[in-house]
Interface confidence: medium
């Protein structure tokens, strides 16, 4: 009866900084004790580590047992489906997981305004998991980018774009009064990780904030 | 004194696509934003993008929604729009424009801040 289930369907990491999740989809017709069995492979030690016997998510949480990630060869996971004494074949991730299949977040945006200029401060992730000397600054110590968008409401104008290197932007607000609407996406140049973008933090600009020299 | 000069303008199908270039003369681009405008019949010009000739400040009209790209060619002196996923609503004549300075600022989405203009080039988007 080995092999009567069948298997995940497919199995796959959805990760950001120090946060690496796996994923998979559940057998068809599974029953109410069909659980998980999730295992994980790291390259360069080629042998299966049993991570949970028997998980009824259909995600698990690697975070713990992948910090080193940034500073490997990766990794990979299999999934295989339990019922009592049965249990299916694995179902392996299709890829190797790297610092590449990261995706890029910032922590936060913070903005303020000053004479007619918006200025805003991007914050890096700050992750509880991550071991003190690696920061996002050091794991990506070179060519950090940010997409910024902005959104004026009211206004039909609703996405202006810049990138930006550094973690510090400013925009000339031209005499435009309203509420500025900021996102950001960060990337880096010389890697192919995907970015997502922040959620949108919002400043309102009025009269007052603009200064008048002669 | 700059002179633009646009082309690539044409008959495009619904969902097509068209590559619109933008080539200056008299001038150099290097301390200019430079971008397009568009006016559809019957109406009055409408922001659709533009790009800092350093080309680190793209900015987009919202209804652009991803399907435009801009870009510059510095040893060309030449603006190019590339528009992708054409619409009926797109048909329009496509105006070139030039402003001096590349601050990062919204005055770049105003028609009022662009010195120079080419003739324009029309798109037409119809089955």
């Known amino acids: 009866h080995g092999t009567e289930l069948p298997s995940p369907p497919s199995v796959w990491f959805e990760a950001e900084f120090f946060h690496h999740i796996l994923h998979w989809t559940p057998i068809p017709n599974q029953s109410e004790s069909t659980c998980y069995e999730v295992a994980l492979l790291r390259y360069g030690i080629e042998s299966w580590n049993s991570i949970s016997n028997c998980s009824q998510t259909l995600s698990y949480d690697l975070t713990a047992v992948t910090l080193d990630l940034y500073h490997s060869n990766g990794y990979r996971a299999r999934v295989r489906a339990v019922d009592g004494s049965r249990h299916s074949n694995w179902t392996v991730t299709n890829t190797r997981f790297s610092v590449d299949e990261v995706t890029l977040t910032v922590g936060s945006v913070n903005l303020e305004i000053h004479n007619g200029f918006i200025l805003g401060k991007i914050q890096l992730p700050r992750p509880k998991m991550a071991p003190a000397n690696d920061t996002y600054e050091s794991i990506f110590s070179h060519f950090r980018e940010y997409e910024i968008a902005i959104r004026k409401v009211p206004g039909n104008f609703t996405f202006t774009h810049k990138k930006v290197k550094h973690e510090n932007f400013s925009l000339l607000t031209s005499g435009e009064v309203g509420e500025f609407c900021v996102q950001v996406k960060p990337s880096v140049a010389s890697r192919s990780n995907k970015g997502m973008w922040s959620k949108e933090e919002c400043i309102s600009l009025t009269r007052q904030y603009f200064t008048v020299t002669n | 004194e700059v002179q633009l000069l646009e082309s690539g303008g044409g008959l495009v199908q619904p969902g097509g696509s068209l590559r619109l270039s933008c080539a200056a003369s008299?001038?150099?681009?290097?301390?200019?934003?430079v971008g397009w405008f568009r006016q559809a019949p019957g109406k009055g010009r409408e922001f659709v993008s533009a790009?800092?000739?350093?080309?680190?400040?793209?900015y987009f009209g919202d209804f652009v929604e991803g399907r435009f790209t801009i870009s510059r060619d510095s040893s060309k002196n030449t603006l190019y729009l590339q528009m992708n996923s054409l619409r009926a609503e797109d048909t329009a004549v496509y105006y070139c424009?030039?402003?001096?300075?590349?601050?990062?600022?919204?005055?770049?989405?105003?028609?009022?801040?662009?010195?120079?203009w080419g003739q324009g080039t029309l798109v037409t988007v119809s089955s």
């Open positions: 008299g001038r150099t681009f290097s301390s200019h934003t």
């Open positions: 790009i800092t000739w350093n080309g680190d400040t793209t």
């Open positions: 424009a030039a402003a001096t300075g590349q601050v990062w600022s919204l005055q770049y989405l105003r028609e009022s801040s662009y010195a120079y």
